[in-house]
């Protein structure tokens, strides 16, 4: 198959009724048949990608290069788009035959590898309508969905899932943690026509739920009754002072008293030093502030809870998930440290197909990738040890030379020569 596959399925009515299973559910028609692959990009045809992907026309933007990186599972299969310049914005996009996800599942999937040990940079994709001017894609360009990992500083290591709903970008209310190691990871977003979603990393579910519950698309179903307020006689005190309790008569004693054992120094001169006052000490009989005993409040009514009413502003929307038009996939990113590789892009309507595709791409090469990285790390460790040994050897040699220089000069004769010399002399 070619490196880029685009297939738009818009079946006619006859095809639908003959070939597809029909299911009616919540005003939505579900088509369950052959998977529609709207977009697939694996970068398997060398420089062919340059004719399919469009860069923003701006000289100071970063360049993407085709690379499998410093380590990989398969040098050819693992080639993807790699950010190559530090501290740059990146803007690159590919178009496909426009489609709508109305009445069907949408699956967006791709792999990301931050082999540079990323400090701050995006690893997400944006899905745009086909009205996007690809040559002028930028951070404020309106998109339908933004999905993928984002790392920036110690505080941000998350998977963004953002939907544009009625013209506004709405962020997920949950915190989905992304992978922050140096290996390739598979990110999958599934959006279903029953307004549910699922996020998977490495083909394992990390989050799921309902669009309405996990995003603030709609006003809340319930609101606090604006006409209700806490009655003035509502008593929220669980305990009160015991009215029958009274302070003992001998309670009030000063906190500090003059030290009874202190004596005026003999050399104290009242004219010079003023009137002598004994130093004060803590009064052992001081009891502190008296507080009446606490008893249960007979009028206690508990904490007043503001009653809620149905929000008149709320009305359900069964088509939150749906978009009329998807036509462009874009990488619109900032990276402080470059080196991220994007690969294995897939947009489809079939969850099983996406999982299979993930297993056949990321799944096949992940173990070999780790092996190669481990081998490199081991070689690096060995090289480091060798360098350390060499350094130590050099240091020892230098020390020996220094010692020789410092010690007094002796004739440089071998033991054998010295012994023979002594024998002949004798």
């Amino acid at each position: 198959s070619s490196s880029l596959e685009v297939l738009f399925q818009g079946p006619g009515l006859n095809d639908i009724f003959e070939a597809q299973k029909i299911e009616w559910h919540e005003e939505n028609l579900y088509f369950q048949g052959e998977p529609a692959v709207y977009f697939k990009e694996q970068f398997l045809d060398g420089d062919g990608w340059t004719s399919r992907w469009i860069e923003k026309h701006k000289s100071d933007f970063g360049k993407f290069v085709l690379s499998s990186g410093k380590f990989y599972g398969d040098e050819e299969k693992d080639k993807g788009l790699q950010t190559s310049q530090d501290a740059r914005f990146y803007a690159l996009s590919a178009s496909f035959e426009p489609f709508s996800n109305k009445g069907q599942t949408l699956v967006v999937q791709f792999t990301v590898k931050h082999e540079q040990n990323i400090d701050c940079g995006g690893g997400y994709v944006k899905l745009f309508p086909n009205s996007l001017d690809q040559t002028d894609m930028h951070g404020d360009s309106e998109y339908n969905i933004m999905f993928g990992p984002d790392i920036c500083g110690p505080g941000t290591k998350k998977v963004h899932v953002i939907f544009n709903y009625k013209g506004k970008n709405v962020l997920i209310n949950k915190d989905i943690r992304c992978k922050d190691d140096e290996f390739t990871h598979l990110y999958t977003l599934i959006v279903r026509p029953d307004n549910t979603y699922e996020v998977k990393i490495d083909n394992s579910q990390v989050e799921s739920g309902s669009l309405e519950d996990d995003w603030d698309f709609l006003p809340p179903k319930k609101i606090k009754d604006p006409d209700a307020s806490k009655p003035e006689d509502w008593d929220e005190r669980a305990k009160i002072d015991d009215p029958t309790d009274s302070k003992p008569e001998d309670w009030d004693k000063p906190e500090h008293i003059p030290d009874p054992d202190a004596k005026k120094p003999e050399d104290w001169d009242e004219e010079m030093d003023g009137e002598w006052e004994p130093p004060v000490i803590q009064n052992p009989e001081y009891k502190g502030e008296w507080k009446p005993r606490q008893i249960d409040n007979p009028d206690y009514k508990g904490t007043w809870i503001h009653p809620e009413i149905d929000n008149p502003e709320y009305s359900p929307d069964p088509s939150i998930y749906a978009y009329d038009n998807f036509g462009v996939l874009g990488l619109d990113l900032w990276q402080v440290k470059s080196g991220t590789i994007f690969d294995n892009f897939l947009i489809t309507n079939d969850e099983a197909y996406a999982e299979e595709f993930g297993n056949e791409t990321w799944g096949v090469t992940k173990a070999a990738e780790k092996q190669m990285k481990d081998k490199q790390d081991e070689e690096q460790r060995t090289r480091r040890m060798m360098r350390t040994k060499m350094r130590m050897r050099r240091m020892r040699r230098t020390r020996r030379k220094m010692r020789r220089k410092m010690s007094p000069a002796r004739p440089r004769t071998s033991c054998r020569e010295a012994c023979l010399q002594g024998w002949t002399e004798a």
Partner: antibody, heavy 127, light 107 residues
Amino acid sequence: EVQLVQSGAEVKKPGSSVKVSCKASGGTFSSYAISWVRQAPGQGLEWMGGIIPIFGTANYAQKFQGRVTITADESTSTAYMELSSLRSEDTAVYYCASSPLRGSGWYWHYYYGMDVWGQGTTVTVSS
Amino acid sequence: SYVLTQPLSVSVAPGQTARITCGGNNIGRKSVHWYQQKPGQAPVLVIYRDSNRPSGIPERFSGSNSGNTATLTISRAQAGDEADYYCQVWDSSTVVFGGGTKLTVLG
């Protein structure tokens, strides 16, 4: 939570430059975006620009482009705003304000508002 | 460039509800933040992303945003709420502030 402390008041001559500093403490400097906002006497708030220290790049309001330079020194957790070619209309209180870093795109930092502000620095431009 | 329009002043009796509006073309598509500024002090964020309250801001402050108008609502107004209020959005890589509204609590 981060705290922002600004440099003291300045009196400048028209045509000269002023450099105001904003030192952050109590948080990781690289986890914030810093904006500069000014307020002329009796007027509203006006955004001049911002910087994300970890990015090292600044973003300026059209009106101040070419006249303002915003920088950050991560080693001292300090952001700077330099305004050149001063005129009397630049007499104002200059504030630095921070937004938490929520991602690697410019828009994130303004998505949550500016939640911590410096005490303000009064700059008077007079001949 | 994007323009945010606020009324110059709003008055409210103590204990009543004050509503401050912020108009802008399709502002409902943007995230709106609100700041409170008392005389001689730096601004304070009271609402972010249309309707979210930062910690320490009383529940009496709430926000909404749809169509061409965003609204800051202060219920059970108190004398201490008297201040200037500014709305703010992010548009075309720029922060835009409204002109500000002076809230007067009568009495």
